[in-house]
């Protein structure tokens, strides 16, 4: 019986010759745990592991700590890959993070961080980011230095309020901060003056809830 080939991320999938967009099974080294992830094999040279996507409001993102830990949704549509997998993956080698955004007027923009990793669960999956470039703002809409992750049942933010309950969705809230890509999905013409929408302040300003978001990672130097 041949040895089972496993891939830790979409970059490995790409390098193995699978260069078609789609859902692939990923496994961390020294682990039997499998996750299904969407691989973007076309954008910017391919090899991108999608860790978050919003596109139509079909999936509820107001989830528990455990759900954000293991992931939820549909990898072909709206989903969250899972904080535990992303934490382990991004601590094994250096990864870049690209955040692709769409507004309701047909515009697109991105933020690219040259180094991204999540701390362990013991450290509340704190986000670490370095080296911002891109078209979605010269200032990072993810507060710097990075914050701990918060969910509706795990309040780790810096606010006297509970940001995840107030804004909906799990995120690296500050108090509450300039972004929340896991906020409430609002349809076109109902997407302004929103206190709890899908927010990326340094591109679209306050209260604007975006049409689509994708967070994707790839090893640095791919």
């Amino acid at each position: 019986k041949g040895e089972q080939i496993s891939f830790r991320d979409c970059a490995e999938v790409f390098k193995s010759g699978h260069t078609t967009n789609g859902v692939y099974t990923l496994t961390l080294p020294n682990s039997t745990e499998e996750v299904k992830a969407y691989c973007d094999m076309e954008a910017g040279g391919g090899g991108w592991t999608i860790i978050q996507r919003r596109e139509d409001g079909s999936v509820d993102f107001q989830r528990t700590w455990k759900e954000y830990k293991v992931g939820f949704g549909n990898p072909s549509g709206e989903y969250w890959l899972g904080n535990e997998f992303v934490s382990q993956l991004t601590n094994q080698q250096r990864y870049v993070l690209k955040i692709h955004l769409k507004d309701w007027e047909g515009n697109e923009a991105y933020s690219l961080y040259e180094h991204f990793y999540l701390s362990s669960e013991e450290l509340n999956y704190r986000i670490h980011l370095k080296g911002l470039t891109g078209t979605a703002g010269k200032i990072s809409s993810i507060s710097q230095p990075g914050n701990d992750f918060s969910t509706k049942d795990a309040d780790n933010d810096k606010c006297i309020c509970k940001c995840s309950q107030m804004l909906t969705g799990g995120w690296w809230f500050d108090a509450c901060g300039p972004s929340n890509l896991n906020g409430m999905y609002y349809p076109q013409r109902q997407n302004t003056n929103k206190f709890n929408g899908i927010k990326w302040y340094y591109w679209k300003g306050s209260g604007y809830s975006l049409k689509g978001t994708t967070m994707m990672i790839r090893p640095a130097g791919f």
């Epitope: 810096k158 606010c159 309020c161 107030m166 108090a175 300039p178 929103k194 206190f195 929408g197 306050s206």
Partner: nanobody
């Protein structure tokens, strides 16, 4: 639907007065802070004053202290900005904006600009002789 509508702007001579109004709908002032901001041509938007109706707390930028007074009438769901001793440098479009009152960092009193998620369309104030 959350809406903020400013009114009361206009042309006034230096040393004169104006009262701006910000009428809120879709939420009650009790649970929110309202800020007044202004933006002069070619300049960044800047905070002028803010109020938390629930606690009666107020904030003023140094440039308007002693000249501007912010107040609220919760029965009318309206916030006012009384502007006295107006100067040419006060010329700008004035906006009101809202933020949930609880969205405060531990140990701080007021809110960064990016926390104000609901905005009005603005009212123009021109101070000129």
């Amino acid at each position: 639907e959350v809406q903020l509508v400013e009114s009361g702007g206009g042309l006034v001579q230096p040393g004169g007065s104006l009262r701006l109004s910000c009428a809120a709908s879709g939420f009650t002032l009790d649970d929110y802070a309202i800020g007044w901001f202004r933006q002069a041509p070619g300049k960044e938007r800047e905070g002028v004053s803010a109020i938390r109706s629930s606690g009666g707390s107020t904030y003023y930028a140094d440039s308007v202290k002693g000249r501007f007074t912010i107040s609220s009438d919760n029965s009318k769901n309206t916030v006012y900005l009384q502007m006295n001793s107006l100067r040419p440098e006060d010329t700008a479009v004035y906006y009101c904006a809202a933020v949930p009152a609880g969205r405060l960092r531990f140990g701080e009193q007021w809110y960064p600009l990016y926390e104000y998620d609901a905005w009005g369309q603005g009212t123009l104030v021109t101070v000129s002789s």
